[in-house]
């Protein structure tokens, strides 16, 4: 067990907080719950803290929660390949570039640590080139969200991760907003960290509304498995 | 040392607004749980509302529900409280409390009256 992973056998406090600027729309929010790495599980609630959120919930969940991968489930035999753990608690950078199909894009930066006992997701979001009546800025994504498999590789010269992914947003006319992420993660402190061989995470998300919350908000519940690595031939045999 | 510097308060007609400020010194850390708290003459302390660490949690007694709202501005450390529809039943002396050991945690009771710093108290009489 890394040092780092020993911090995540309870449930841990969650904070996010994020300054975002969209097409020089500006606006904050921020995110508390907790998470259970034991089960992969996140609870988290989000406010706007600047009003009316000017860009649809949906293309914010990778930001926040697939910004606290630390809390992802890795299986006995691949917890070897858990970077996001062993790196806390310094924490790590976590830089991202998310393409919007025919669309803008947003460039995000977050620091994740622990502060205290809780784990902190410090982000800033400036997202460009967005359309004023395309389906991000015109709020055409369905208040939903799919499943997806997020590829994360060894960077041996950054003491990090690269991680792909493509995210599938649902929109109200049936079809599909793609959102391709190019993700960068290197550790804030200088001890050792575990860099992984391929392998990915699946993850499920599930959005909904607290019915006694006025301001603009989301709540999330989702489930982080990581995955594709195998059990060696030994462990077959035994 | 953690101090709690409160302002506000005053006198105010029945079905008035008043606004509580309480401000936050000499901690860094992470920014702490924080409550509103009210003595009534000749009664016990008793619990007003409460906001979680980012401000996204917030509980309310029943007594205030649907007229008091809690709220925070990190960036200036401060907590408020903006009391609508003032009750003769309201006037009491109102105390900001602090939890550091909350922390970020906001799946914790609210309610507890054993929090780590307390404001020094600021007077709301409301009169019929």
């Known amino acids: 067990m890394s040092k780092g992973e020993e911090l995540f056998t309870g449930v841990v406090p969650i904070l996010v907080e994020l300054d975002g600027d969209v097409n020089g729309h500006k606006f904050s929010v921020s995110g508390e719950g907790e998470g259970d790495a034991t089960y992969g599980k996140l609870t988290l609630k989000f406010i706007c803290t600047t009003g009316k959120l000017p860009v649809p919930w949906p293309t914010l969940v990778t930001t926040f929660s697939y910004g606290v991968q630390c809390f992802s489930r890795y299986p006995d035999h691949m917890k070897q390949h858990d970077f996001f753990k062993s790196a806390m608690p310094e924490g790590y950078v976590q830089e991202r570039t998310i393409f919007f199909k025919d669309d803008g894009n947003y460039k995000t930066r977050a620091e994740v640590k622990f502060e205290g006992d809780t784990l902190v997701n410090r982000i800033e979001l400036k997202g460009i080139d967005f359309k004023e009546d395309g389906n991000i800025l015109g709020h055409k994504l369905e208040y939903n969200y799919n499943s997806h498999n997020v590829y994360i590789m060894a960077d041996k010269q950054k003491n990090g991760i690269k991680v792909n992914f493509k995210i599938r947003h649902n929109i109200e006319d049936g079809s599909v907003q793609l959102a391709d992420h190019y993700q960068q993660n290197t550790p804030i402190g200088d001890g050792p960290v575990l860099l992984p061989d391929n392998h990915y995470l699946s993850t499920q998300s599930a959005l909904s509304k607290d019915p006694n919350e006025k301001r603009d908000h989301m709540v999330l519940l989702e489930f982080v498995t990581a995955a594709g690595i195998t059990h060696g031939m030994d462990e077959l045999y035994k | 040392q953690v101090q709690l510097q409160q302002s506000g308060g005053g006198s105010v007609q029945a079905g008035g607004s008043l606004r509580l400020s309480c401000t936050i010194s000499g901690r860094t850390s992470i920014n702490p749980y924080m409550a509103w708290f009210r003595q009534r003459p000749g009664k016990e302390r008793e619990f007003v509302a409460a906001?979680?660490?980012?401000?996204?949690?917030?509980y309310y007694a029943d007594s205030v529900k649907g007229r008091f709202t809690i709220s925070r501005d990190n960036a200036k450390n401060t907590v408020y409280l903006q009391m609508n529809s003032l009750k003769p039943e309201d006037t009491a002396v109102y105390y900001c409390?602090?939890?550091?050991?909350?922390?970020?945690?906001?799946?914790?009771?609210?309610?507890?009256?054993?929090?780590?710093?307390w404001g020094q108290g600021t007077q709301v009489t409301v009169s019929s």
């Open positions: 409390a602090a939890d550091f050991r909350r922390g970020g945690n906001w799946n914790v009771d609210p309610f507890r009256y054993d929090y780590d710093y």
């Open positions: 906001i979680s660490s980012g401000g996204v949690y917030t």
